[in-house]
Interface confidence: low
């Protein structure tokens, strides 16, 4: 018996071939011997089956001795053995219809779980193998779960259903709702304007929700809310903002925040959360601010950084075009009685300069000038 696999909602064509290459009488019946369709001369006749309005054939093929049964908009309950009667012969075809759906919305937040459920006819024992867009192979039975979705799981999931050495392939588009970056770090000299950007890793027609930026300053004992905002059809409106610092926010996506000036008391870590309408859970992006200050007080030239720096970062003080006078894995370095000239304070990671601040040391009879 021939086995054909079909997909729920699709169209299937079951073949039936006569040895004579001409139009002769044929009938398609189901396992209960109820006539589905057949012919009377060159006319298509239909029986009383449930498939009535969804069953068809191709008259153009009858003259070649081919009498297909076409079933449109397949349903799981169409799974059955179909019998073609032609030339005193009976050809049996077993049709198995499967459906695969994401049993939740196909737009899921990063970290959430995706469950794919297979609808299958009674008596079948299919196996399912799905491949995520990042090439991850997942196998399962009637249900298949993937926990902790990552950004790389966005895209088309290709699932193969195997039954009786036959296979049928499903494609499901999954959108993982997340920020493009889980974390970012901004390095600024004291007094500079700070730009924070929070680009989303997905695009949807309408985006509505609300968000908030909580900030934990390095010098503060507790975190505080710097800004809250609403998002309506990709338009941003600020609800509440602290007076210190007074952040400004862009009115359109991507989410964009401006801190008028970088000050040591603002250095620290922030967490931007975005709650989307009709979604449980929130999107998160961490943002870090490192602030540098170079000062000269009396005979002491000091360079300091505030904020979440890695222990491997190097802080150096050097006179322009000369070797570093002092270089330490510390958050503050200083030089006593510095020579006159342009001094550079450098924060670097494996030789790559992340932040630089220059300070001019004048002869001892002058006062310092900070560019």
């Amino acid at each position: 018996k021939k086995v054909v696999l079909g997909k729920k909602g699709d169209t299937v064509e079951l073949t039936c071939t006569a040895s004579q290459k001409k139009s002769i009488q044929f009938h398609w019946k189901n396992s209960n011997q109820i006539k589905i369709l057949g012919n009377q001369g060159s006319f298509l006749t239909k029986g009383p089956s449930k498939l009535n309005d969804r069953a068809d054939s191709r008259r153009s093929l009858w003259d070649q001795g081919n009498f297909p049964l076409i079933i449109k908009n397949l349903k799981i309950e169409d799974s059955d053995t179909y019998i073609c009667e032609v030339e005193d012969q009976k050809e049996e075809v077993q049709l198995l219809v499967f459906g695969l759906t994401a049993n939740s919305d196909t737009h899921l937040l990063q970290g959430q779980s995706l469950t794919l459920t297979l609808e299958s006819p009674p008596g079948s024992s299919p196996s399912v193998q799905c491949r995520s867009p990042r090439g991850k192979n997942i196998q399962g039975g009637k249900t298949l779960s993937v926990s902790q979705l990552e950004l790389q799981d966005s895209g088309t999931w290709t699932c193969t259903v195997l039954q009786n050495q036959k296979k049928v392939e499903f494609k499901i588009d999954i959108v993982v709702l997340a920020f493009q970056k889980a974390s970012s770090i901004v390095y600024k000299k004291e007094g500079e304007q700070v730009e924070f950007s929070f680009p989303l890793a997905f695009t949807v027609e309408k985006l509505t929700g609300s968000g908030e930026l909580w900030w934990q300053a390095e010098r503060a004992s507790s975190s505080k809310s710097w800004i809250t905002f609403d998002l309506k059809n990709k338009e941003v409106s600020v609800k509440r903002v602290t007076q210190d610092p007074k952040l400004q926010m862009g009115k359109k996506l991507p989410l964009h925040l401006t801190l008028p000036q970088a000050l040591p008391q603002y250095a620290g870590s922030g967490n931007l959360t975005l709650a989307l309408e009709a979604k449980t859970g929130k999107l998160h992006q961490e943002v870090n601010l490192v602030v540098m200050r170079a000062t000269q007080l009396q005979k002491n030239l000091t360079c300091e950084v505030w904020g979440p720096t890695s222990p491997k970062l190097m802080l150096s003080l050097k006179l322009e075009n000369k070797e570093a006078k002092v270089s330490k894995r510390e958050k503050a370095v200083w030089v006593l009685n510095p020579e006159a000239g342009m001094w550079q304070c450098l924060l670097s990671d494996s030789g790559q300069v992340l932040l630089e601040s220059n300070i001019k040391v004048l002869p001892t009879w002058s006062t310092p000038v900070q560019p």
Epitope: R134, G135, K136, N137, Q139, S147, Q148
Partner: antibody, heavy 118, light 108 residues
């Protein structure tokens, strides 16, 4: 430095049990598939088990029902519980990390030796 | 089970020569799921190629992979002394994720 280090190998009698451990460091352990692969002296590589990030587990027929792979993400640790051991299980057992964006074992340990003998 | 067959079993070549190693699968394997490894005596295996043709980090461009379906090839354009080793292919198309028996490349 990204690395995996196996431990727990040793001499065990046929029918006995052994638990291998693999300590991972230098990467976000929970985000990667992890594998056990073995190699008998002078022979080729044989895949033993895989655990996915979702906790999904895979085994070849030769060890199915006898070996159990598990992971403890909080401890950055991978385990292989081996029961009903046979002489044919004697080998060097390697722990390996699966690629993040692709299929392939991109980080391997030095291996731990398991000897099943009476 | 997908069975991988590697040929030849041993390849005897001189430094500077081109090495062509074959890996044949008993049934079709998506190229995304084929990897190649190198193993030297007393050492752990090392990933060379993933996705049939993508070089792993740090692998020189004299090493390349190709193929699709059931036939895959690993090519080393000019053999260097450090390339003499055993090479294995592995498939992830379906569980069990089998390895080939290996091809030994030794000095002529």
């Amino acid at each position: 430095e990204v690395q995996v280090v196996e431990s727990g190998g040793g001499l065990v009698q046929p029918g006995g049990s052994l638990r291998l451990s693999c300590a991972a460091s230098g990467f976000t352990f929970s985000s990667y598939d992890m594998h056990w692969v073995r190699q008998a002296t002078g022979k080729g590589l044989e895949w033993v088990s895989t655990i996915g990030t979702a906790g999904d587990t895979y085994y070849p027929g030769s060890v199915k029902g006898r070996f159990t792979i598990s992971r403890e993400n909080a401890k950055n640790s991978l385990y292989l519980q081996m029961n009903s051991l046979r002489a044919g299980d004697t080998a060097v057992y390697y722990c390996a990390r699966g690629g993040y964006y692709y299929y392939g074992m991109d980080v391997w340990g030095q291996g731990t030796t398991v000897t099943v003998s009476s | 089970e997908i069975v991988l067959t590697q040929s030849p079993g041993t390849l005897s070549l001189s430094p500077g020569e081109r090495a062509t190693l074959s890996c044949r699968a008993s049934q079709s394997v998506s190229s995304s799921y084929l990897a190649w490894y190198q193993q030297k005596p007393g050492q752990s295996p090392r990933l060379l190629i993933h996705g049939a043709s993508s070089r792993a980090t740090g692998i020189p461009d004299r090493v390349s992979g190709s193929g699709s379906g059931t036939d895959f090839t690993l090519t080393i354009s000019r053999l260097e002394p450090e390339d003499f080793a055993v090479y294995y292919c592995q498939q992830y198309g379906s569980s069990p994720f089998t390895f080939g028996p290996g091809t030994k490349v030794d000095i002529k």
